[in-house]
Interface confidence: low
């Protein structure tokens, strides 16, 4: 189920899998709940920590039991992913951070008169994803007023630094409130050129492109069908980015599709999920447990109950059924996507909905901490 | 909203107007979306309108002036008031909508939690009230949907700027004691929201208050952890499933 | 400017009748209960009948109660008086009011028109 | 219905005294009370409402108190521009004026 409690001066021992430094713990836990195999994370405030460089640590962390041992540190804050939490998950954070500088790669500087303008301007510009605005009492004159758009390889930055007069936040992007606009073209037969920032495999072009959309880096993308000439490339989704926001170039390529991410479109985003059912497909990954059900329907829904099952593979064959009911396969893998996707399968699969944000699950319970 | 400023696109995503459409079409009162086809307002919003078919309800809105006849609105499919609620008092001052047709989630128009039953423990320090009303006593119904960060005041202080009224414990009261910001006509109905543990809850709806903004006279507003039991019955008991959003 | 004009007075015969009319402009005339309230020559003054802001409730003084209607057309901003079997006795300036900050709902009258006078008399 | 009783009905006074007109209801009526002024040939004019709230951009020299059924109106320093009738008005239960009371240079 979904919990939203949050424990105060305590950290999770062991589990990691990833860390990042985030300005507060509801944007750890933001991070958390859109990470493949993150369940819980723990955060550490300036003020907890002497360690500068374990200052605005976000710790994003994994377990088998869905639990983790939770140590005393004060300061510390620590909680749940909202991966089962329907409506409540949510990239879009608008908070803006008094005194604190959230360093990047700075690509663009600009005279504006107020940090809502700072954050209108990066929410505008397609390859920012933080921004640090000096406000009119910076200590040092030259820098007043300046806007400073930023990007990182992880989308978050690469420090977080207390600096007095000086405001941070992200881009509104996520919250569907970009003015660019996107492209909701598909290029059939069109292979795009530039830089891959990662690369996936996904039964079909719109997993690719959603997917695109919640990655940090990826502006566009290229698709390669299952009936791609080179059987080693096909279903793979290439993550890609630029200089200049676009494709530089793009090549006609049979059974290849392109297209562009989601995250800059105005007033609506596709949800962080994938609700189709793929016949006739196997999706392979780590196995996480195998169960007997009644249909694909309730194979998908067993999956997206079991928080940690991050896709699902529904078996017809007649050795894996018993009367009505058949296996069901729940599994997982690093990124969140299938390691390999067969064709011809007596089967069906598909994805956990746990991150579709129109759900009914009882988003906002809350279980009291015990000590 | 006295005091306030504009809010942005998705800010108060539960946020809702309440139109009548008789000849000409009117937003008359704020309401919270609590579930797919639940949304949550103040019972005196109904006074003398208790006709279910004109009124039209607006969500994922911020501009009321880009409201046009193509705008989708939903329709209701009941009204539900609470029982104890009498036209001539404050009391009880909270009304359910059933929606005919349930609603989908975007950024734009998604449910705000409810708080837990008879929640008394929790200290809300970060709460804003937000709506179309009036920006002054004597004023009119806002375009842009504005916002105001108002701290909450015990009862005992409300009673006390309320002699004449009695502040029940099924009442929240929130105001500055300089005055200056307020929640005001065309507000009822709508959220008073705190932000706890980084989530939303829905702490009260906008009910009534001496004036707008005046000094050492809060708005009160209907508590409605005070009203979960009713909320839970009358939500699962028009259609089996309690469809809000609501904490275990 | 928020403004109460109301018109229609004038001499009438007991047992006729009379449609008295309130434009109102400068406010949002949907949002209010309205109300009529007279006063006699050289008399105080009299609460006649009032209406909620969709006609959906209306409500009278025991000395006018089937004789009066009191109605309004929110896309005219205006409210209505109609008068039947009038007396000597409903001989006043009528006058429309209503009040402009509604919170707590019981509320007095804080805008008032001109009046118009209505002479019952044969 | 409530009744309202104003007294007295006529009060004579000079420029400068205190003014203090009373209005009992037949029942009470909580601090639902407003009082009006009306000058001849001319609208009534809102006070006060609630008993003792000054409606805004009347002067501070007019004050009202009480709750239940006995309320007062005070003038604390009676002006030339304040002669006239005033009127006491009960809102618990619909509307009820109360018979008037008429201030007139002594």
């Known amino acids: 189920g979904c919990l939203t409690q949050l424990y105060e001066n305590a950290f999770f021992r062991g589990g990691d899998v990833a860390s990042m430094y985030t300005p507060n713990a509801q944007y750890c836990q933001m991070r958390c709940t859109f990470h493949p195999r993150c369940l819980l994370f723990s955060f550490l405030p300036a003020s907890s920590i002497n360690d500068m460089e374990k200052r605005f640590g976000c710790f994003l962390k994994d377990s088998v039991t869905g639990t983790l041992p939770k140590v005393h540190r004060t300061g510390a804050v620590s909680g749940h992913s909202l991966k089962q939490c329907g409506h409540q998950i949510s990239a879009c954070h608008r908070d803006i951070y008094k005194g604190v500088d959230m360093r990047g790669v700075n690509f663009n500087v600009s005279k504006v008169s107020s940090v809502e303008e700072c954050q209108k301007r990066c929410t505008s510009n397609i390859r920012c994803q933080f921004f640090s605005y000096a406000t009119q009492t910076f200590h040092k004159a030259e820098y007043r007023n300046n806007c400073l758009l930023k990007y990182s390889p992880g989308g978050t930055p690469t420090a977080i630094k207390v600096l007095s007069n000086v405001e941070s936040g992200f881009s509104l992007k996520p919250c569907a409130l970009s003015e660019i606009g996107c492209h909701m073209n598909i290029f059939q037969h069109l292979a795009f050129s530039d830089v891959d920032v990662a690369r996936v495999l996904t039964p079909d072009a719109f997993v690719c492109r959603t997917i695109c959309t919640y990655h940090p880096n990826c502006l566009f993308f290229t698709f390669y069908t299952n009936v791609w000439k080179i059987e080693s490339q096909r279903n793979v989704c290439l993550l890609k980015t630029s200089e200049s926001g676009t494709p530089s170039s793009s090549t006609p390529q049979e059974n290849t599709i392109s297209g562009y991410s989601l995250l800059t479109c105005k007033r609506t985003l596709p949800e962080p999920c994938h609700s189709k059912i793929y016949p006739g497909v196997d999706f392979g990954g780590e196995e996480l447990n195998v169960t007997f059900v009644k249909g694909v329907n309730v194979c998908q829904e067993t999956c997206t109950k079991m928080i940690r099952c991050q896709f699902f593979t529904y078996s017809l064959l007649p050795e894996d059924c018993k009367e009505e009911k058949c296996k069901c396969f729940l599994r997982l893998s690093m990124d969140g996507s299938p390691t390999r996707i067969a064709y011809g399968t007596q089967g069906s699969s598909g994805y956990s909905l746990r991150l579709c944000n129109t759900g009914d699950n009882s988003v906002c319970t809350t279980k009291t901490s015990t000590r | 909203i006295v005091g306030g400023t504009n809010s942005s696109w998705g800010e108060w995503p539960w946020q809702v107007s309440l139109q009548v459409k008789l000849t000409a079409q009117r937003h008359l009162c704020g309401g919270s979306l609590i579930g797919h086809q639940w949304v949550l307002t103040a019972a005196h919003c109904f006074d003398g309108l208790p006709l279910q078919d004109v009124w039209r309800i607006y969500s994922g809105i911020l501009n009321l002036s880009d409201i046009t006849k193509d705008t989708p609105f939903s329709q209701i499919k009941e009204i539900i008031i609470h029982q104890n609620y009498k036209v001539s008092e404050g009391n009880h001052d909270i009304a359910l909508i059933k929606l005919q047709a349930p609603l989908n989630y975007t950024e734009f128009q998604k449910p705000i939690c409810l708080p837990s039953k008879g929640d008394t423990s929790t200290i809300y320090t970060n709460c804003w009230v937000t709506g179309w009303g009036f920006s002054k006593e004597k004023g009119e119904i806002q375009n842009i949907l504005q916002k105001v960060n108002i701290p909450l005041v015990t009862n005992e202080e409300c009673q006390k700027r309320y002699q004449d009224y009695k502040i029940t414990q099924r009442m929240v009261c929130a105001g500055y004691k300089e005055g200056g910001k307020d929640a005001c006509k065309g507000d009822s109905g709508g959220p008073l929201v705190c932000k706890h543990n980084g989530m939303w809850r829905l702490v009260g709806i906008t009910s009534w208050g001496e004036g707008c903004a005046r000094r050492e006279q809060p708005g009160v507003y209907t508590k409605v952890a005070e009203y979960m039991d009713w909320i839970l019955e009358k939500t699962q008991s028009s259609d089996g499933k309690a469809q809000m959003q609501s904490p275990a | 400017e928020v403004q109460l004009l109301e018109s229609g007075g004038g001499l009438v015969q007991p047992g006729g009748s009379l449609r008295l009319s309130c434009a109102a402009s400068?406010?949002?005339?949907?949002?209010?209960?309205m109300m009529w309230v007279r006063q006699a020559p050289g008399k105080g003054l009299e609460w006649v009948s009032g209406i909620y802001s969709s006609g959906g409730i209306t409500v009278y003084a025991d000395s006018v109660k089937g004789r009066f209607t009191i109605s309004r057309d929110n896309s005219k901003n205006t409210l209505y008086l109609q008068m039947n079997s009038l007396r000597a006795e409903d001989t006043a300036v009528y006058y429309c009011?209503?009040?402009?900050?509604?919170?707590?709902?019981?509320?007095?009258?804080?805008?008032w028109g001109q009046g118009t006078m209505v002479t019952v008399s044969s | 219905d409530i009744q309202m009783t104003q007294s007295p009905s006529t009060l004579s006074a000079s420029v400068g005294d205190r003014v203090t007109i009373t209005c009992r209801a037949s029942?009470?009526?909580?601090?639902?009370l407003a009082w009006y002024q009306q000058k001849p040939g001319k609208a009534p004019n809102l006070l006060i409402y609630k008993a003792s709230t000054l409606e805004s951009g009347v002067p501070s020299r007019f004050s009202g108190s009480g709750s239940g059924t006995e309320f007062t109106l005070t003038i604390s320093s009676l002006q030339p521009d304040d002669f006239a009738t005033y009127y006491c008005?009960?809102?618990?239960?619909?509307?009820?004026f109360g018979q008037g009371t008429k201030v007139e240079i002594k």
């Open positions: 029942q009470s009526i909580s601090s639902w």
């Open positions: 008005q009960q809102y618990n239960t619909y509307w009820t």
């Open positions: 400068g406010f949002t005339f949907s949002h209010y209960i």
């Open positions: 009011a209503y009040r402009r900050s509604g919170v707590p709902r019981r509320d007095a009258f804080d805008i």
